[in-house]
Interface confidence: medium
């Protein structure tokens, strides 16, 4: 299992090459641990494999295996990144019949600078 309210090292292979190496669970979709997140991510692999957006891998990892810094500051993907990826990939999302999780609907995410991400306390944001 994972330790409550502390960052943990990333073990999902696809996301181990990201610029961050610590994550926190549950994620935005409520997946309890990395093994579940890895399985759920597989539905989106056609998008990653076909590289429909330059940012697809970054977005999927930030959504399913969120960045965690300073123990309990969890960083969800920013809205602008979400909008770009969704727009770039919409044709393939439709083609493959991929269900875009409502938790990842872009208008639910905050505008923020990807380099200086908005952080929030998972006690209230993820579990509330």
């Amino acid at each position: 299992g994972h330790s409550l309210f502390t960052c943990e090292p990333i073990t999902v292979p696809r996301c181990m090459k990201m610029a961050y190496n610590m994550t926190f669970f549950p994620n935005l979709m409520g997946h309890y641990d990395q093994s579940i997140a890895a399985v759920e991510m597989e539905h989106f692999l056609p998008l990653a494999n076909l590289e429909c957006s330059p940012n697809i891998e970054t977005f999927l990892c930030k959504a399913f295996v969120p960045t965690c810094i300073e123990q309990i500051h969890v960083v969800p993907p920013c809205r602008k990144l979400c909008e770009k990826v969704y727009s770039d990939c919409k044709k393939l999302i439709d083609t493959f019949g991929i269900r875009w999780p409502e938790e990842l609907e872009c208008d639910r995410l905050q505008y923020c600078d990807e380099t200086v991400p908005v952080t929030f306390d998972p006690h209230t944001e993820f579990l509330g």
Epitope: E51, P54, N55, E57, K84, S87, K91
Partner: antibody
């Protein structure tokens, strides 16, 4: 403002290779695919392929497969297009073009273009 | 590969004329069609994307329509700066392909 600045004109002999550069500025380099399009004298436009500056992933037109290589240097926001085994029919202006998105969900057009690089292949 | 056929290949028109250029795809491309304007010695300029969306900064006299296989670029009132070559391009699938171009000349 967005700018794509390409390297200068080249004269090459048949069988040689040419490497054209395209330096991007004014936007986040890794956010947009970069495409290469060429135009032979008095002819139309021909798509050669594209590179994902984020991952380095490429997608080449079948016609150029095995002869073209697209690379990028994220530290300088520059993409490169190398074409090998040149022949006279490769004489053309080579353009890099950035593919942006418009929130329309479509595969968008090329909204910014380099100034073009003339490659003359002649013996 | 998807073939893009433009017509006419050239046309002569006067300032103020309404000009229509057509583009036909060899298979359905939905609305994944773009239009470009190119002047001699210059890079192409994006006018219309997604068949009918006007690119930012492009005058409203340019408009695009169509879906599936048949598309149209219309210039409602030709201006002196509009004399150029126009290309359609499909962005439905790779390889991305362009029409052969339509040269708009002064009558």
């Amino acid at each position: 403002q967005v700018q794509l600045v390409q390297s200068g004109a080249e004269v090459k002999k048949p069988g040689a290779s040419v490497k054209v550069s395209c330096k991007a500025s004014g936007y986040t380099f890794t956010n947009n695919f970069m495409h290469w399009v060429r135009q032979a004298p008095g002819q139309g436009l021909e798509w050669m392929g594209r590179i994902n500056p984020n991952s380095g992933g490429t997608n080449y037109a079948q016609k150029f497969q095995g002869r073209v290589t697209m690379t990028r240097d994220t530290s300088t926001s520059t993409v490169y297009m190398e074409l090998s085994s040149l022949r006279s029919e490769d004489t053309a202006v080579y353009y890099c073009a950035s593919q942006n998105y418009y929130g329309s969900g479509s595969y968008p057009g090329f909204d910014y273009w380099g100034q073009g690089t003339l490659v003359n292949v002649s013996s | 590969d998807i073939q893009m056929t433009q017509s006419p290949s050239s046309l002569s028109a006067s300032v103020g004329d309404r000009v229509t250029i057509t583009c036909r795809a060899s298979q359905s491309i939905s609305s994944y069609l773009n239009w470009y304007q190119q002047k001699p010695g210059k890079a192409p300029k994006l006018l219309i994307y997604a068949a009918s969306s006007l690119q930012s900064g492009v005058p409203s006299r340019f408009s695009g329509s169509g879906s599936g296989t048949d598309f149209t670029l219309t210039i409602s009132s030709l201006q002196p700066e509009d004399f150029a070559t126009y290309y359609c391009q499909q962005s439905y699938s790779t390889p991305l392909t362009f029409g052969g171009g339509t040269k708009v000349e002064i009558k």
